[in-house]
Interface confidence: low
């Protein structure tokens, strides 16, 4: 199921505005006209190629002219060379032969972009699209009627002065080339000199194939059907009353109109040739939506055609096609996953009317910024009891800033760091505390995307502990009992409690133990003592808590 999408290999920072989501096709747009790329503000060119898998030729016999076909034309169209059937034509399937993506399916494609350049936009990640929207007010939609392969029509040689890039069942020849049918039915390119016959063909033979361009005027919203024949023919409608052609054009046709036109000329016999016109819907009634969820815009392309206004045309005549890379999807939408972030991909999309191209758009879609990489070579260490430092190298992919979090359970603090930093000094840390640090890059794109965090740990140096808490002294005739609780900040490994007992300036006891629960015996009665309690954490002694207490008067005296 893998498919290769051929991206442009570019990354752009500025893209033109195109109709997406709720924007319909702009009113100045005519989707049949050649693309104008001279006004683009970016550095890539755009094309509207036909799809590589376009097998849409349709054989239409002169007697059954219900399959008039609408083609997209991407160049300026004037007179078109009639199609000359070959053996290959009879084996060409009509649409529907392309692989169908199941209804509602997401196309899990493997898309391989070419390497990108290193320029990184500082613009917050926009998912940019560009599409080819022609701008001519009036432009052609070619329609070709093709004789059945067994038709004995003697087609006159014609000259085309235009090359149309649409790949359709019409043979387009360069100027000054002509075609004549060979005995085998194949097409022969010859010089302009052609032997003529004296007998007049029937009009049905002479005009067996009349290419028709539908020229759309986006101001009036009406079409002109241009009959591409060499002579000024006469056309009548069903009433056969008056000529409805002016310079081979049927004017002011509304969308979705079907009508029969009878073509005649004095160079052919048998009255007239019947030609069915089938006018397509107005161009602006179609809109190509970008349906990509923001959260997936870095690896996903979602495009979907919508009909944004009703029309009377038979919707069954409309089919949709997308081609991204070498895979074609015959569905009104595509959902391509697992793409590379921050690359420009190219998808061609067509709407076909009566199995021939009607609207053709090339979309250049830049996927959103991806998830940034992990910071590299992350090292952290303590500097003293209250400071630490972390150093790193930036990640490979685009990012906007870093988030640094440091945790000493259960407290957690996070900081936003500038993208240009590679070192950060942490201040006001707690002594003898294990800090877990995590550093990740993030980017603000359609949504914020956080990269994988790099982690490291350090423990700050010891420092003097704080004072013991809740010191209580109880006295008797010749003893004292001292209790206290652990300091609020030990600031070092577990140590010992110390009690110094002084009488005047004389140290009479110096006790230490792991619990702050001291019994001091054999003291003199009715004497004041200074009691100093403190904690030693293995490296530093804390400030003592000093209480002055007296033993009792000797109750036994």
């Amino acid at each position: 199921q893998g498919s290769t999408l051929s991206p442009t290999g570019r990354r752009t920072t500025k893209m033109p505005s195109v109709p997406l989501s709720s924007d319909p096709l702009p009113t100045h747009t005519t989707a049949f006209s050649p693309a104008s790329i001279s006004e683009r503000e970016n550095d890539f060119s755009e094309t509207t190629p036909s799809l590589s898998s376009d097998n849409t030729s349709t054989q239409v016999s002169p007697d059954s002219l219900d399959n008039a076909s609408a083609f997209n034309t991407t160049g300026v169209s004037s007179a078109l060379t009639p199609h000359l059937p070959t053996h290959a034509d009879s084996q060409t399937p009509s649409t529907g032969t392309d692989t169908q993506t199941p209804s509602g399916s997401a196309a899990n494609t493997t898309l391989s972009p070419t390497p990108r350049s290193n320029d990184i936009s500082d613009v917050p990640g926009e998912r940019s699209t560009a599409s080819t929207f022609p701008t001519d007010p009036i432009s052609p939609l070619a329609t070709t009627l093709i004789p059945a392969r067994n038709s004995s029509a003697a087609l006159p040689a014609r000259t085309s002065n235009t090359t149309i890039t649409a790949n359709t069942s019409v043979s387009y020849l360069n100027a000054s080339e002509t075609t004549t049918p060979s005995p085998s039915g194949s097409t022969v390119i010859s010089t302009p000199t052609i032997a003529t016959t004296t007998s007049k063909p029937t009009c049905a033979e002479k005009y067996a194939t009349i290419p028709v361009d539908y020229l759309y005027n986006n101001k009036t919203k009406l079409f002109t059907a241009k009959l591409n024949v060499n002579e000024n023919v006469e056309c009548t409608n069903n009433n056969h009353t008056h000529n409805i052609c002016t310079n081979n054009e049927v004017l002011n046709l509304p969308e979705c109109k079907e009508m029969n036109v009878f073509v005649s000329h004095n160079s052919c016999t048998d009255r007239h040739k019947e030609l069915k016109l089938d006018v397509p819907p107005e161009v602006e009634k179609f809109q190509l939506d970008d349906c990509t969820p923001d959260v997936e815009a870095n690896t996903t392309i979602c495009l979907k055609w919508k009909i944004i206004e009703t029309f009377a045309c038979d919707k069954s005549k409309i089919t949709y096609r997308f081609q991204c890379g070498n895979k074609t999807y015959n569905k009104e939408g595509i959902y391509l996953e697992n793409l590379e972030p921050e690359y420009e991909y190219k998808c061609d999309s067509e709407i076909l009317y009566n199995n021939h191209k009607y609207i053709n758009i090339t979309k250049l879609i830049k996927t959103d910024f991806g998830i940034p990489g992990q910071p590299q070579n992350v090292v952290c260490r303590h500097e003293d009891a209250h400071q630490g430092v972390i150093t790193w190298n930036p990640p490979q992919r685009s990012f906007h800033n870093f988030t640094l979090c440091y945790v000493n359970k259960p407290a957690k603090k996070c900081l936003i760091l500038d993208k240009h930093l590679t070192t950060y000094h942490l201040q006001n840390l707690k002594p003898y505390t294990n800090y877990s640090l995590s550093l990740h890059a993030y980017i603000i794109a359609k949504v914020q995307r956080n990269g994988t965090a790099a982690t490291c740990n350090f423990t700050t140096e010891s420092a003097p502990p704080s004072q013991v808490q809740n010191m209580i002294v109880s006295t008797s005739d010749n003893s004292m009992h001292v209790k206290c609780e652990v300091p609020r900040d030990v600031n070092g490994p577990t140590g010992l409690y110390h009690l110094e007992v002084e009488a005047g300036n004389t140290l009479v006891r110096n006790l230490s133990q792991s619990k702050c629960d001291f019994s001091v015996n054999n003291l003199q009665y009715s004497t004041y003592y200074n009691l100093k309690a403190y904690y030693h954490n293995g490296k530093y002694s804390g400030e003592p808590v000093i209480l002055r207490e007296s033993t009792s008067y000797n109750s036994k005296a």
């Epitope: 709720s22 993506t101 199941p102 209804s103 509602g104 399916s105 997401a106 899990n108 969820p293 959260v295 997936e296 690896t299 996903t300 979907k304 919508k306 009909i307 944004i308 009703t310 569905k331 009104e332 939408g333 959902y335 996953e337 697992n338």
Partner: antibody, heavy 119, light 106 residues
């Protein structure tokens, strides 16, 4: 034939958890978005959660966000809904539905499984 | 979030009647609206998707129209099997159902 079969419903106390499953068959499961919809007794339909074909996009309404988790196992053709911190107002029939992405429409539904949250 | 308001909330009609149910969105949802039918004790069934597209197998007497904020489901000639509850559903921005319209026999 497209089939969706929910299971895992039952009676649970407020604050408790349940895990619903939806077994899919008859279509290519990993091509479709999937959605959970619920219906409280005598009430209308309420959207609960949606997940993209790859699992890369997940959506919840505010009233279940942080409590419910949608997931899928494409190798097993199964959709899940993990429901934590359940409340009385989560009592409902829970349906899983296949989400036709392009139309946005849910074109195939399971028969539903009943979740009752009560002390 | 987008709110969907259906009206009427209930409706009595007879076989053969033409029935219209409306759904109003609190903001523009383009044409991203579907209609579902639900019968008691059963799962919902998709009728119309994207405002006016008839789901395969659904009778042509059902039709949908509208765009932007105002949408309509029409049943041109009620049949006995059409008595049910109908829901609109928007998928333009997140997802929201209307509160439902119960269609009953008069």
């Amino acid at each position: 034939e497209v089939q969706l079969l929910e299971s895992g419903g039952g009676l649970v106390q407020p604050g408790g958890s349940l895990r619903l499953s939806c077994a899919a068959s008859g279509f290519t499961f990993n091509n479709y978005w999937m959605t959970w919809v619920r219906q409280a007794p005598g009430k209308g339909l309420e959207w609960v959660s949606s997940i993209s074909s790859s699992g890369g996009s997940i959506y919840y309404p505010d009233r279940v966000k942080g409590r419910f988790t949608i997931s899928r196992d494409n190798s097993k053709n199964t959709l899940y809904l993990q429901m934590n911190s359940l409340r009385a107002e989560d009592t409902a029939v829970y349906y899983c539905a296949r989400d036709e992405r392009w139309a946005g429409a849910m074109d195939a539904w399971g028969q539903g499984t009943t979740v009752t949250v009560s002390s | 979030d987008i709110q969907m308001t259906q009206s009427p909330s209930s409706l009595s009609a007879s076989v053969g009647d033409r029935v219209t149910i409306t759904c109003k969105a609190s903001q523009n949802i383009n044409k991203n609206l579907d209609w579902y039918q639900q019968k008691p004790g059963k799962a919902p069934k998709l009728l119309i998707y994207e405002t006016n597209n008839l789901q395969t197998g659904v009778p042509s007497r059902f039709s949908g129209s509208g765009s932007g904020t105002d949408f309509t489901l029409t049943i041109s000639s009620l049949q006995p099997e059409d008595f049910a509850t109908y829901y609109c559903y928007q998928h333009n921005s997140r997802f929201t159902f209307g509160q439902g319209t119960k269609l009953e026999i008069k």
